[in-house]
């Protein structure tokens, strides 16, 4: 229904706390360089204005759209051109072009320093002094680094953060209470960020239809007892929520997400038997819980998929009459029977089925042509299954760090033109799939591995889009989202690449490496490994292992030495010589 004042409507629906949090996230995601204080001032002004509209919906400007109100605020920021360059040109446009322009200027890799966590005591002090400001800083810092973070979910993580601080700051040993808990939240939030970015990419590149197909598959796996009409309704609503968030309409997105959660909890009987625990929780926890609820038990009496989609005499008639609906029912029926498949795989199967019908239904004898379609799925299913087996075996053999290194070598060979920091970040993220997925039960491994890899590779594509350097990467990133992972997996050594000159300074280290945290040490070593591969793309695994073992030994020796600096300056050049010889 239409409201006289959109801003008053959203303020009333969301309440002041969530309203302010979402406006802060929106501003931080649009203008990623502004300080917290600048954004906090704008948020307060918007909130004060919203309150005047709540008091009187006919007050001046209360009838304006949220994009107009927010855009006007952002465009009024002083020194916009100096700080943001051509983004300032957006302000010469009218809505809706102005908002589209802001969206196009979101930076997936802003040049901001890593979000450093303060020391426990300091954190607790500032949290106790002003919890609201503390949480505001958290929202601002995460949102500006992750401009597509799912806003209502970021409110959930802020709430988690708040609860952890409340609990741990009351403990004697704050540090040991906070560190593992906050690390856990950080890890989950980073995964949430890449997953959501993938959804927005799907929406931006391929439109609502592509996202809705993803949603149908995912929801059908989770709710196999819900009928097709129910799944379609949920998928349509979920598509709207994600479209709004990806489009920067964060107030509408959060409001509609709350509505969807409410609907699901009011209709558990027709959706799933597993929702009650989630539905007992307060709003943010409820919506989060529903988004990752366990799969319902599959109905026992499901007929073979072939009955309706291969053997039925009316396959081509049904397909021709309502292609999207027929393919949707195929995706629904296949997905509800296969919680053990990844969504990407299910979408590839649906695509194969569609291509088969397009070809066969135009022929003289369609049933003879499409009769073998299910058998033709086999190679498509085997490929990711083999990928999971091979990679999980390797992970179990090497551990996370070793597995990351194996992936780093593999991907540097596939795309040696890509910058070393991007390759290291990608390999570290791809390597985490082992820890995340390989320990799961067999039937959960494939969906976990492939859907996570797809999300990470989406980030690789986004970073590469900014500065395209590798034809291999461009080729894989240009195709459909669901084909990306198989495309990257199939890449081999780039034969067109001219090896990098060997530069001794690339492999020269100093004693400061000794005091770095373990993660930073690993990154330094992985940076060296990527550079080695760029110098010798065809080096064997054995050669690289020899060099890296030598390198590790060198670091260990010099970091234990009484005179570290002397050790690094004398042993370093020897290491470089040995490396060159080993790779000759």
């Amino acid at each position: 229904e239409a409201h006289k004042s959109e801003i008053a409507h959203r303020y009333n629906d969301l309440g002041e706390q969530h309203f302010k949090g979402l406006v802060l996230i929106a501003f931080s995601q649009y203008l990623q360089k502004c300080s917290y204080d600048e954004h906090a001032k704008l948020v307060q002004e918007v909130t004060d204005f919203a309150k005047t509209c709540v008091a009187d919906e006919s007050a001046a400007n209360c009838d304006k759209s949220l994009h107009t109100l927010f855009g006007d605020k952002l465009c009024a920021i002083p020194n916009l051109r100096e700080n943001y360059g051509e983004l300032a040109d957006c302000c010469t446009k009218q809505e809706p072009e102005r908002n589209e322009c802001f969206l196009q200027h979101k930076d997936d890799n802003p040049s901001l320093p890593p979000f450093e966590r303060p020391e426990a005591e300091a954190m607790c002090t500032s949290f106790k002094e002003n919890p609201t400001t503390f949480m505001g800083h958290y929202l601002h810092e995460v949102a500006r680094r992750h401009p597509y973070f799912y806003a209502p979910e970021l409110l959930y993580y802020a709430e988690q953060y708040n609860e952890i601080l409340t609990q741990c700051c009351a403990e004697a040993d704050k540090e040991s209470c906070l560190t593992p808990k906050l690390d856990g939240v950080k890890e989950k939030a980073l995964v949430s960020s890449v997953r959501q970015r993938m959804k927005c990419s799907s929406m931006q590149k391929f439109g609502e239809r592509a996202f809705k197909a993803w949603a149908v598959a995912r929801l059908s796996q989770t709710f196999p007892n819900a009928d097709f009409a129910e799944i379609t309704k949920l998928a349509t609503d979920l598509t709207k929520v994600n479209k709004e968030c990806c489009h920067g309409d964060l107030l509408e997105c959060a409001d509609d997400r709350a509505e969807l959660a409410k609907y699901m909890c009011e209709n558990q009987a027709t959706i799933s038997s597993k929702l009650q625990t989630c539905c007992d929780k307060p709003l943010l926890k409820k919506a989060h819980c529903l988004s990752e609820v366990e799969h319902d038990t599959m109905p026992a009496d499901l007929p073979a998929i072939a009955a309706d989609f291969v053997e039925d005499q009316e396959v081509c008639k049904n397909y021709a009459e309502a292609k999207d609906v027929f393919l949707g029912t195929f995706l629904y029926e296949y997905s509800r029977r296969h919680p053990d498949y990844s969504v990407s795989l299910l979408l590839r199967l649906a695509k194969k089925y569609e291509a088969t019908l397009e070809k066969c239904c135009a022929e003289a004898n369609p049933p003879a042509c499409y009769g073998t379609v299910l058998a033709e799925f086999q190679p498509l299913v085997e490929e990711p299954k083999n990928l999971v087996k091979t990679n999980c075996d390797l992970y179990e053999k090497l551990g996370e760090y070793g597995f990351q290194n194996a992936i780093l070598v593999r991907y540097t060979q596939k795309a040696p033109q890509v910058s070393t920091p991007t390759l290291v970040e990608a390999a570290r993220n791809l390597g985490r799939v082992g820890t995340k997925c390989c320990t799961l039960p067999e039937d959960q491994r494939l969906p976990c591995v492939e859907d996570y890899l797809s999300a990470i590779l989406n980030r690789v594509c986004l970073l590469h889009e900014k500065t395209p350097v590798s034809e291999h990467v461009t080729k894989c990133c240009s195709g459909s989202l669901v084909e990306r992972r198989p495309c990257f997996s199939a890449l081999t050594v780039d034969e067109t690449y001219v090896p990098k000159e060997f530069k001794a300074e690339t492999f020269t280290f100093h004693s400061d490496i000794c005091t770095l945290p373990e993660k930073e040490k690993q990154i330094k070593k992985q940076t060296a490994l990527a550079e080695l591969v760029k110098h010798k793309p065809k080096a064997t695994a054995e050669q690289l292992k020899t060099v890296m073992d030598d390198f590790a030994q060198f670091l260990d020796t010099c970091c234990k030495a009484a005179d570290k600096d002397t050790c690094f300056s004398t042993e370093g050049p020897n290491l470089v010589t040995r490396c060159k010889d080993a790779l000759a």
């Epitope: 081509c316 008639k317 397909y319 021709a320 009459e321 309502a322 609906v325 135009a362």
Partner: nanobody, 123 residues
């Protein structure tokens, strides 16, 4: 709103021909499959033929195969049914139809339909 207007019906002798037309509006015609169904006096709806959105796929009921031809012109938002070698049993009201969101595929009572055009085949 969705509108389907059939025309071209009439009285014809057995063995004769007619060409039915259906002008569509109120929906995205070029992405919609189209259907002809018919209803003989005192009978239920019977499916006759279906054509896909891009006209690549055409399907016919056994009773009309080889005699009827379905076609469409997406530029004119029109679907046609060319009926040759007409028989007495082809006498019916012919409806042009398209899928309605939320209905079951093949459940023609629930599809969007026009008012129909009467085809009478008699000596």
């Amino acid at each position: 709103e969705v509108q389907l207007v059939e025309s071209g019906g009439g009285e014809v002798q057995p063995g004769g021909s007619l060409r039915l037309s259906c002008a569509a509006s109120g929906f995205t015609f070029s992405t919609s499959g189209m259907v002809w169904v018919r209803q003989a006096p005192g009978k239920g709806l019977e499916w006759v033929s279906t054509i896909s959105d891009d006209a690549r796929i055409t399907v016919y009921a056994e009773s009309v195969k080889g005699r009827f031809t379905i076609s469409r012109d997406n530029a004119k938002n029109t679907v046609y049914l060319q009926m040759n070698s007409l028989r007495a049993e082809d006498t019916a009201v012919y409806y042009c139809a398209t899928y309605r969101a939320g209905s079951r595929i093949g459940s023609y009572e629930d599809y969007y339909r026009g008012q129909g055009t009467l085809v009478t085949v008699k000596p």
